[in-house]
Interface confidence: medium
C-alpha cells in the first residue's frame, strides 16, 4: 500500500493506539468508558468495515465464474458431451464440444473418458445416458449405466447404477437414464461412466452427457 | 451512518491519521516502530475486524435464503410446477404454485414458460417430465423432452434431451424423464422445456417440474 | 482479546475517535476535510481491511468439507444407500453404508427412513430408485416413487413423483427412476421416499439411493 505521505508529524505511539485499545475494551465488554457509548462506537466502526467488505464484494467481476469467495475457493464444475467411439471398451467417451462446461483446471477431462478433480471435497456428480435397444436383438440382461470412481491407490468402485430393460419397439426403442449423487472425492480422483453396450448409446445433441460440481 | 455527534473537538488531521499510517507501515513490513510490536498491533486489529465480520455473518437471518455472502452473492434458485395448457406450442407451461421455490428476483418465471436469470454464472438446471402415452395412439417417433436455452441475441440451443419410446400399455403407459446439467448462463438468458406432445404430460402433484440453482 | 497492556496513557476519548469520525465523514460524503484526500484515506483503510479478510480466507483449512465460510455456514450434504427391509411399509429404508456421505450432524438419517435437517434453507434433494416389475404380476397401477416432506407441526406433502408402467419382460423388467429438485426446508424437516411396492426395489450396489445438499 502507498504510505500516507502527506502526514509528516508522528505522535507518540502510546497515544496512537488508544483508539484501538478503546474499541478493544468495548469489544471485551469493559464499561469504564466515558463520553461515548460503546454500542455507538462499535456500530459506527462495524458499519464502516461492513461497507468496505460490501464494496470488496461489489468489485468482483460478475462475469467470471472461475473465482468465488477469493482465489481460495474457485467454482469447480464440468459438463461434457458424449462422443461416439470405435473402441470396444464399455467406458463411454466424452468431449469438450457443443455447450460444454469446464470451469478451470481444477477439473479435467482425461483421455476423453474420465473427469478428474484436483481438490478434495464433496461433489454432486451426474450422468445422463440415452440409448436405443431392442429386446430381441439384445442380450437377456438389461441395459445398465454405472457411474464409477477411481481414487489414487484404491480399487475402482461403483457409485451409482441404473438399469432399463430393452424395449420391444422396432428397430429399437429409445430410453433415457439419469444418475446423480453427492460423493466425497480425494485429490486426483476420477469418475467415469460404464455401460453394458456402448453401441446402443445415442449421441444426438443433448442426449448423453456427464458432469459434476463441487459443493 | 449516523455521525458521532457527541465528539465536538477535532484535532489536526495530520495527527488523526498517524494511527492508520502506523498500521499501514506494519502491514508493508516497515520495522522502525518503537514501543509496540507490529504483530501485536496487527493481530489485535485483525482480531477485531474478524469479530466484526463473524458478527456480520452471525446476524444474518438464518431463516432467509435470499442473501448469502452479502447482497453481492445471494442464493439464486427456482423450482416451478407444471401447468396444463390449451396452447398448441410444444413449450411446457409452469406456475409458482404448490411447494414451489423462487429465491428472489434474480431468477423469474416469464410468461409461465421460461426461467430467466439476471446474473451470469454457472447454474445446475433440471427438469422432470412424467408423461402417459401409447405406442398405437402416438407417432412412430419417441416422446422427447428437451431442455433449451435462449440467450439474448442468440438462437435457442438444446442443452439436454431425453427420449422414451411409447408404452404398449392401454390406454397409456406412464414414464418419467429426468434431465439435469451444469451450464453457464449469460445475464438475461432463459431456459425452457420442450416436449414432442404436451397433451401427454402428467400434471398430478409432483410429476412434472422444472428448476435451477446458481452454483 | 488481550488488551494492549503496553499502552498506559489514555487521552481524552473525544480526541481518540476523531479518527473514526473523520473516516465516517469521508464515507458519508462530507468534503470539509483538509490536508488529506478522502479517497486516499478510505482506500488505505479499505486496503488494510481487505488484506485482513484475504488472510482470514487463506487460513481456512482446504481439506475439510465440514466448514465453509466460517462455522456459520458448514457444508450440509448426505447420500444414503438403500436397504432391503422386511417391513410392510411403503417408505424405503436407507443406511449409512458403502460409499455414503454424511457431512456432519446438521443432517441425520433417522430410523433408517428419513433425512432430517437442523437448519432452514434451500436444499437440492434427490432420490434414485431402480425396480424390477412385470405387468402381469403387478397391479394395473404404475410403479410410483414419491419424494415426501414432513415438517414439524405440518402435514406430510409430496414434493416430487415419478411413474413408470410395469414392463412386459419376464420374470420382471428393470427400470430406474430419478427424482430431484430444490426445496426450502425448515429446521427439523424430514424428507423420505415412498414407493408403491417396496418388494420390487433393486438393492444391488448403486441402484437405489437418496440424498440432499444444502445450497
Amino acid at each position: 500500500h502507498r504510505r500516507l505521505d502527506k502526514i509528516e508529524d508522528e505522535r507518540n505511539l502510546h497515544e496512537d493506539f488508544v483508539f484501538m485499545k478503546t474499541i478493544q475494551r468495548c469489544n471485551t465488554g469493559e464499561r469504564s468508558l466515558s463520553l461515548l457509548n460503546c454500542e455507538e462506537i462499535k456500530s459506527q466502526f462495524e458499519g464502516f468495515v461492513k461497507d468496505i467488505m460490501l464494496n470488496k464484494e461489489e468489485t468482483k467481476k460478475e462475469n467470471s465464474f472461475e473465482m468465488q469467495k477469493g482465489d481460495q475457493n474457485p467454482q469447480i464444475a464440468a459438463h461434457v458431451i458424449s462422443e461416439a467411439s470405435s473402441k470396444t471398451t464399455s467406458v463411454l467417451q466424452w468431449a469438450e464440444k457443443g455447450y460444454y462446461t469446464m470451469s478451470n483446471n481444477l477439473v479435467t477431462l482425461e483421455n476423453g473418458k474420465q473427469l478428474t478433480v484436483k481438490r478434495q471435497g464433496l461433489y454432486y456428480i451426474y450422468a445422463q445416458v440415452t440409448f436405443c435397444s431392442n429386446r430381441e436383438a439384445s442380450s437377456q440382461a438389461p441395459f445398465i449405466a454405472s457411474l464409477c470412481l477411481k481414487s489414487p491407490g484404491r480399487f475402482e468402485r461403483i457409485l451409482l447404477r441404473a438399469a432399463n430393460t430393452h424395449s420391444s419397439a422396432k428397430p429399437c426403442g429409445q430410453q433415457s437414464i439419469h444418475l446423480g449423487g453427492v460423493f466425497e472425492l480425494q485429490p486426483g480422483a476420477s469418475v467415469f461412466v460404464n455401460v453394458t453396450d456402448p453401441s446402443q448409446v445415442s449421441h444426438g445433441t443433448g442426449f448423453t452427457s456427464f458432469g459434476l460440481l463441487k459443493l | 451512518h449516523r455521525r458521532l455527534d457527541k465528539i465536538e473537538d477535532e484535532r489536526n488531521l495530520h495527527e488523526d491519521f498517524v494511527f492508520m499510517k502506523t498500521i499501514q507501515r506494519c502491514n508493508t513490513g516497515e520495522r522502525s516502530l518503537s514501543l509496540l510490536n507490529c504483530e501485536e498491533i496487527k493481530s489485535q486489529f485483525e482480531g477485531f475486524v474478524k469479530d466484526i465480520m463473524l458478527n456480520k455473518e452471525e446476524t444474518k437471518k438464518e431463516n432467509s435464503f435470499e442473501m448469502q455472502k452479502g447482497d453481492q452473492n445471494p442464493q439464486i434458485a427456482a423450482h416451478v410446477i407444471s401447468e396444463a395448457s390449451s396452447k398448441t406450442t410444444s413449450v411446457l407451461q409452469w406456475a409458482e404454485k404448490g411447494y414451489y421455490t423462487m429465491s428472489n428476483n434474480l431468477v423469474t418465471l416469464e410468461n409461465g414458460k421460461q426461467l430467466t436469470v439476471k446474473r451470469q454464472g454457472l447454474y445446475y438446471i433440471y427438469a422432470q417430465v412424467t408423461f402417459c402415452s401409447n405406442r398405437e395412439a402416438s407417432s412412430q417417433a419417441p416422446f422427447i423432452a428437451s431442455l433449451c436455452l435462449k440467450s439474448p441475441g442468440r438462437f435457442e440451443r438444446i442443452l439436454l434431451r431425453a427420449a422414451n419410446t411409447h408404452s404398449s400399455a392401454k390406454p397409456c403407459g406412464q414414464q418419467s424423464i429426468h434431465l439435469g446439467g451444469v451450464f453457464e448462463l449469460q445475464p438475461g438468458a432463459s431456459v425452457f422445456v420442450n416436449v414432442t406432445d404436451p397433451s401427454q404430460v402428467s400434471h398430478g402433484t409432483g410429476f412434472t417440474s422444472f428448476g435451477l440453482l446458481k452454483l | 482479546h488481550r488488551r494492549l497492556d503496553k499502552i498506559e496513557d489514555e487521552r481524552n476519548l473525544h480526541e481518540d475517535f476523531v479518527f473514526m469520525k473523520t473516516i465516517q465523514r469521508c464515507n458519508t460524503g462530507e468534503r470539509s476535510l483538509s490536508l488529506l484526500n478522502c479517497e486516499e484515506i478510505k482506500s488505505q483503510f479499505e486496503g488494510f481491511v481487505k488484506d485482513i479478510m484475504l488472510n482470514k480466507e487463506e487460513t481456512k483449512k482446504e481439506n475439510s468439507f465440514e466448514m465453509q465460510k466460517g462455522d456459520q455456514n458448514p457444508q450440509i450434504a448426505a447420500h444414503v444407500i438403500s436397504e432391503a427391509s422386511s417391513k410392510t411399509t411403503s417408505v424405503l429404508q436407507w443406511a449409512e453404508k458403502g460409499y455414503y456421505t454424511m457431512s456432519n450432524n446438521l443432517v441425520t438419517l433417522e430410523n433408517g427412513k428419513q433425512l432430517t435437517v437442523k437448519r432452514q434453507g434451500l436444499y437440492y434433494i434427490y432420490a434414485q430408485v431402480t425396480f424390477c416389475s412385470n405387468r402381469e404380476a403387478s397391479s394395473q397401477a404404475p410403479f410410483i416413487a414419491s419424494l415426501c416432506l414432513k415438517s414439524p407441526g405440518r402435514f406430510e406433502r409430496i414434493l416430487l413423483r415419478a411413474a413408470n408402467t410395469h414392463s412386459s419382460a419376464k420374470p420382471c423388467g428393470q427400470q430406474s427412476i430419478h427424482l430431484g429438485g430444490v426445496f426450502e426446508l425448515q429446521p427439523g424437516a424430514s424428507v423420505f421416499v415412498n414407493v408403491t411396492d417396496p418388494s420390487q426395489v433393486s438393492h444391488g450396489t448403486g441402484f437405489t439411493s437418496f440424498g440432499l445438499l444444502k445450497l
Epitope: K97, T205 | S90, A141, G153, R154, E156 | -
Partner: antibody, heavy 118, light 107 residues
Framework: EVKLVESGGGLVKPGGSLKLSCTTS????????MSWVRQTPEKRLEWVAS???????YYFDSVRGRFTISRDNARNILYLQMSSLRSEDTAMYYC?????????????WGQGTSVTVS | DIQMTQSPASLSASVGETVTITCRAS??????LAWYQQKQGRSPQLLVY???TLAEGVPSRFSGSGSGTQFSLKINSLQPEDFGSYYC?????????FGTGTKLELK
C-alpha cells in the same frame, strides 16, 4: 425423405405485400428451428428471419417490422408474410431447416421461390 | 453485426487438384461456422458445420478447419461435381451472416 417446398413468390409493386409458404414433410416439423434466406440477383446470400421450435422469432434488421415469420405446427408449414416491399427485397427466397446438432447451420433447403419488387 | 470476408472471390482449378477457400470473421465466432456448396440453378447444400464437422453424406475429401476468426475449407482431389459456388456462414448469433462467396470454376 426431408422435403421443403416454397410457394407464393411473384411480381409485386413497391409497398405491396406477399405471403410465402414452405410446406415440409419427412421430419418432425415442430422440433426444428426454421429460417428464410434470400439470394439477391448478385448471388449474395442474406439471412431474413428465423423461428425456433419454441416459436421465438428473429429478424434481419432491414426486414424487422415489415416481415413476419410464423409456423403452423399442425400443418407443418412455415410462412413469411412480407409487407411494405422494396426493390431491394427482390431475390430468390429459400426456406431452410436448422440442423439438429449443437449447430444452427441449415441442413435442408427448399428449391426457392422468386420475388420481384418492381 | 459480424462480417464474413471470404477469399478468393473466384478460383480456377482442375480435376484432381486440391484447393483451399478461406473465411474471416470480424469478431470471434468460436467454432460456429458452416460451409455451403451451391451449384448453378440449385439451392445451397450444407457441407460443414461447427467449423469442422462434415454434414451427413458429404465426401471425406472435404474438410473444414479453424476457430475464432480464421477458417478454411479444403477440398482434396477435386471431382467434376465439386465445381460451383461456396459460401461460409457463421451460426453464432443473430443476425446470421454469409460470406460473399467463392466461385470455383473448371480450369
Amino acid at each position: 425423405e426431408v422435403k421443403l417446398v416454397e410457394s407464393g413468390g411473384g411480381l409485386v409493386k413497391p409497398g405491396g405485400s406477399l405471403k410465402l409458404s414452405c410446406t415440409t414433410s419427412g421430419f418432425t416439423f415442430n422440433n426444428y428451428a426454421m429460417s428464410w434466406v434470400r439470394q439477391t440477383p448478385e448471388k449474395r446470400l442474406e439471412w431474413v428471419a428465423s423461428i425456433s421450435s419454441g416459436d421465438s422469432t428473429y429478424y434481419f434488421d432491414s426486414v424487422r417490422g415489415r416481415f413476419t415469420i410464423s409456423r403452423d405446427n399442425a400443418r407443418n408449414i412455415l410462412y413469411l408474410q412480407m409487407s411494405s416491399l422494396r426493390s431491394e427485397d427482390t431475390a430468390m427466397y429459400y426456406c431452410a431447416r436448422h440442423y439438429d446438432y449443437d449447430s444452427y447451420a441449415m441442413d435442408y433447403w427448399g428449391q426457392g421461390t422468386s420475388v420481384t419488387v418492381s | 453485426d459480424i462480417q464474413m470476408t471470404q477469399s478468393p472471390a473466384s478460383l480456377s482449378a482442375s480435376v484432381g487438384e486440391t484447393v483451399t477457400i478461406t473465411c474471416r470473421a470480424s469478431e470471434t465466432i468460436y467454432s460456429y461456422l458452416a460451409w455451403y456448396q451451391q451449384k448453378q440453378g440449385r439451392s445451397p447444400q450444407l457441407l460443414v458445420y461447427n467449423a469442422k464437422t462434415l454434414a451427413e453424406g458429404v465426401p471425406s475429401r472435404f474438410s473444414g478447419s479453424g476457430s475464432g476468426t480464421q477458417f478454411s475449407l479444403k477440398i482434396n482431389s477435386l471431382q467434376p461435381e465439386d465445381f460451383g459456388s461456396y459460401y461460409c456462414q457463421h451460426h453464432y448469433n443473430t443476425p446470421l451472416t454469409f460470406g460473399t462467396g467463392t466461385k470455383l470454376e473448371l480450369k
